[in-house]
């Protein structure tokens, strides 16, 4: 797995460099997670044809993966910093159960899957420090999450491969939207 942001040798060897601002650190963290997702997607797409066939194969998706909508204030039109930040944090917290599901779903990228999960936890902490209105952030119910995880794992192999593909694709899209929005803040 790649070295998490701030832990590469260049950072150690350059003590005179200006420390990263909070925004830069968040930006770097998201880009690091996106790199990890790319590696996981590569393994998923090489293993099966889910990536090409998912559109035709899937009739209905009840996974309820977090998604950015106009009302969340993260798009250029109707941009609202506070509303958007709450949505990003809430969405990341909702993705955590799906990232937990992804553990043990990869053979050659097992460490990478763990790195994506851990880096997301760190990103949430960074963003929570930035947020003023923490009361507006709803944390997913652990019982509901446990039940969902059981259901995800009870699916047959083909559906689990499809689920893995859908989670990675949605998480990538969510992070890309978050990155664009955070650069406006």
């Amino acid at each position: 797995a790649p070295v998490p942001p701030g832990e590469d040798s260049k950072d150690v060897a350059a003590p005179h460099r200006q420390p990263l601002t909070s925004s830069e650190r968040i930006d770097k963290q998201i880009r690091y997670i996106l790199d990890g997702i790319s590696a996981l997607r590569k393994e998923t797409c090489n293993k099966s044809n889910m990536c090409e066939s998912s559109k035709e194969a899937l009739a209905e998706n009840n996974l309820n993966l977090p998604k950015m909508a106009e009302k969340d204030g993260c798009f250029q039109s109707g941009f609202n910093e506070e509303t958007c930040l709450v949505k990003i944090i809430t969405g990341l917290l909702e993705f955590e159960v799906y990232l937990e599901y992804l553990q043990n779903r990869f053979e050659s990228s097992e460490e990478q899957a763990r790195a994506v999960q851990m880096s997301t936890k760190v990103l949430i902490q960074f963003l929570q420090k930035k947020a003023k209105n923490l009361d507006a952030i709803t944390t997913p119910d652990p019982t509901t999450n446990a039940s969902l995880l059981t259901k995800l794992q009870a699916q047959n192999q083909w559906l689990q491969d499809m689920t893995t593909h859908l989670i990675l694709r949605s998480f990538k899209e969510f992070l890309q939207s978050s990155l664009r929005a955070l650069r406006q803040m």
Partner: nanobody, 125 residues
Framework: AVQLVDSGGGLVQAGGSLRLSCAAS????????MGWFRQAPGKEREFVAA????????YYADSVKGRFTISRDNAKNTVYLQMNSLKPEDTAVYYC??????????????????WGQGTQVTVSS
């Protein structure tokens, strides 16, 4: 053990109708997707229709749209396929299928967990 029992097949003339039934036992499928697939001699098993357990939404193969209707009776744990305006090319063994979780609904056979034994439908011209 979970069992799906297909029935209602038979020999019918082109333009006629049949109603297939699939009764499930061994567990409740009210929140699970259920579907119908068919296999003609020498051909691969193909998707015909499916119904969601959650939304009740229905999905059809283009070749049967407007002619076939899938429905379910959760109280009876049964799914139906009403087939109208039958054509000779509808001749096949029809299989009922169910998936146990219900998070995703697919038109791919590999996405289903339980299968009926099949019922033969023959449409003569």
């Amino acid at each position: 053990a979970v069992q799906l029992v297909d029935s209602g097949g038979g020999l019918v003339q082109a333009g006629g109708s049949l109603r297939l039934s699939c009764a499930a036992s061994g567990r409740t499928f009210s929140s699970s997707p259920m579907g119908w697939f068919r296999q003609a001699p020498g051909k691969e098993r193909e998707f015909v229709a499916a119904i969601s357990g959650r939304s009740g939404n229905t999905y059809y193969a283009d070749s049967v749209k407007g002619r076939f209707t899938i429905s379910r009776d959760n109280a009876k744990n049964t799914v139906y396929l009403q087939m109208n305006s039958l054509k000779p090319e509808d001749t096949a063994v029809y299989y009922c299928a169910a998936e146990r979780v219900g998070l995703l609904l697919t038109v791919v056979a590999e996405g289903y967990d339980y299968w009926g034994q099949g019922t033969q439908v023959t449409v003569s011209s």
